[in-house]
Interface confidence: low
């Protein structure tokens, strides 16, 4: 197939062809291909035509939509909203070619690289060691440091016990669940509800990459679909990371977490997986998080407290 410009100077902006190569499935747009994508800040006005000699891209709505790279979509992306409820405010306004940049509001901080919510800075009763910054919480002076250490020991002692008890409960329930469903004797899985009760306030944002790693793309899509992420957003994330399914999973889960908020996110995840009969998967995630929390609590936190108090 040859496409040239005739003597009248007709601009051939697009060459329409159809997919013949199987491995290009993910890059397929509306069953057709445009030779030229729309530049940043614009979107496709309509589907590709063989010799579309009119302008084929139109600008995104300033302040409401953007596209930050060349693309073939007929939709611009919606500008990010900096949710005050999550402790965020606008750092840089959305333009046609750049998404909004958010930052923590004054007296809020965020210690993860991608900030989906900021936490309020701790107010110190007995004076400040280190001021709160955008990236770290206030460090407070403590009254009666030594006695606090004993309180800490008492608080931490039951953790391994609780975890052990919970694991036993979980294993029982999941064995029962498996026997009922399959009549088989597989390795124990969890009853997510039992665990969720204990860990409902865990901050999932730091585990999203790990969780994405143990879930398949279809499992992630199924979960986020049922939990408030719309199709447009799912498609957008897919198109942004066409050849990187790992990144698709991370972004889908991040998006769900951002929508859902920190509170009860763990609960929702575990219950959602249980509903979808993904008991083993739920156990994997629970084990990862429990391991991390217990080793954090028992080791690093305990050591750090001893060093700073003794």
């Amino acid at each position: 197939q040859v496409t040239d410009i005739n003597s009248k100077g007709l601009e051939l902006r697009k060459t329409v062809t159809t997919v013949e190569t199987q491995n290009l499935e993910d890059l397929h747009h509306d069953g057709q291909f445009c030779h030229k994508p729309c530049p940043p800040g614009e979107r496709k006005a309509r589907d590709c035509t063989v010799n579309g000699d009119e302008p084929d891209c139109v600008p995104c709505q300033e302040g409401k939509e953007y596209t930050d790279k060349a693309h073939f979509s007929s939709k611009c992306r919606r500008c990010r909203l900096c949710d005050e409820g999550h402790g965020l405010e606008v750092e840089i306004n959305c333009t046609r070619t750049q998404n909004t940049k958010c930052r923590c509001k004054p007296n809020f901080f965020c210690n993860s690289t991608v900030c989906e919510h900021c936490d309020p800075c701790t107010k110190c009763e007995h004076g400040i060691i280190k001021e709160c910054t955008l990236a770290s919480n206030t460090k407070c002076k403590e009254e009666g440091s030594r006695s606090n250490l004993w309180w800490l020991c008492l608080l931490l002692l039951p953790i391994p016990l609780i975890v052990w008890v919970k694991r036993k409960e979980v294993q029982k329930t999941c064995r029962k669940h498996r026997k009922e469903n399959q009549g088989s004797h597989e390795s124990p899985t969890l009853n997510p509800e039992t665990v969720a009760i204990n860990l409902s306030d865990v901050d999932l944002s730091k585990y999203i990459t790990t969780i994405a790693g143990v879930m398949t793309l279809s499992q992630v899509k199924g979960f986020v679909r049922k939990n408030g992420v719309n199709e447009a957003k799912i498609d957008e994330i897919k198109n942004d990371n066409v050849q990187d399914t790992a990144e698709q999973k991370v972004q889908l889960l991040r998006n769900w977490h951002q929508l859902h908020g920190k509170k009860d996110a763990y609960d929702t995840l575990i219950k959602g997986l249980k509903k979808a009969n993904l008991c083993t998967l739920a156990e994997k995630i629970q084990t990862i998080i429990l391991k991390d929390i217990t080793s954090d609590s028992e080791n690093s936190n305990f050591r750090n407290e001893i060093q700073s108090l003794v």
């Epitope: 197939q1 040859v2 496409t3 040239d4 410009i5 601009e11 051939l12 902006r13 060459t15 062809t17 013949e20 190569t21 491995n23 290009l24 890059l27 397929h28 747009h29 291909f33 030779h35 030229k36 994508p37 530049p39 940043p40 800040g41 614009e42 891209c57 790279k69 060349a70 693309h71 073939f72 070619t97 198109n239 942004d240 066409v242 050849q243």
Partner: antibody, heavy 122, light 107 residues
């Protein structure tokens, strides 16, 4: 890392046919347009034309009657043929990776071959 | 064909200077413009695509701006390795065309 390796006859007589080959190593071959550009001695760059892996071509009108760009997908080769050459075709010929055929993105001519000097002289 | 006109054709500058090269299209090309750097006996190297997007691995002292018919390439603080010839190229409509080049020399 994508690399473009070029070769072909460097010295031609007027009226002969210029033939150059550009081999693509590494990276995706089937999602890009592959472009030929030339640069006469001491002058600027001139776009000759482009092709994708399906053989879809776009040519410069000034060379269209003499130029053929073809593709061999089994070898990831792109070739340039220019018939009836004259001294005006003496130039350094480059192949380059062009606009994405499909998928998101646009990077201009982001990867270039080393260039092949072609001299037309009687 | 769309004519691309670069100015100036040549300029002399010193290390540390801020330099701006302009490129004008004879008709609107939206943001479909690329900038290339070419050193003697070397193939051109892509610096900027889509008028203002920095090519991967290119130092941030290079920046591009403009849309429609008027475009600029700016080097915020010239380094010794930046002395070369710079070309703009439109790829909005066929045939894709290049500017005549701007030779940047040491003062």
């Amino acid at each position: 890392q994508v690399q473009l390796q070029q070769w072909g006859a460097g010295l031609l007589k007027p009226s002969e046919t210029l033939s150059l080959i550009c081999a693509v190593y590494g990276g995706s071959f089937s999602t890009y347009y592959w472009t030929w550009i030339r640069q006469p001695p001491g002058k600027g760059l001139e776009w000759i034309g482009e092709i994708n892996h399906r053989g879809t071509t776009n040519y410069s009108p000034s060379l269209k009657s003499r130029v053929t760009i073809s593709v061999d997908t089994s070898k990831n080769h792109i070739s340039l043929n220019l018939t009836s050459v004259t001294a005006a075709d003496t130039a350094l010929y480059y192949c380059a990776r062009g606009l994405l055929w499909i998928g998101e993105g646009d990077y201009g001519l982001d990867v270039w071959g080393q260039g092949t000097t072609v001299t037309v002289s009687s | 064909d769309i004519q691309m006109t670069q100015s100036p054709s040549s300029l002399s500058a010193s290390v540390g200077d801020r330099v701006t090269i302009t490129c004008r299209a004879s008709q609107g090309i939206r943001r479909w413009l690329a900038w290339y750097q070419q050193k003697p006996e070397k193939a051109p190297k892509s610096l900027i695509y889509a008028a203002s997007s920095l090519q991967s691995g290119v130092p941030s002292r290079f920046s591009g701006s403009g849309s429609g018919t008027d475009f600029t390439l700016t080097i915020s603080s010239l380094q010794p390795e930046d002395f070369a010839t710079y070309y703009c190229q439109q790829y909005n409509s066929y045939p894709y065309t290049f500017g005549q080049g701007t030779k940047l020399e040491i003062k």
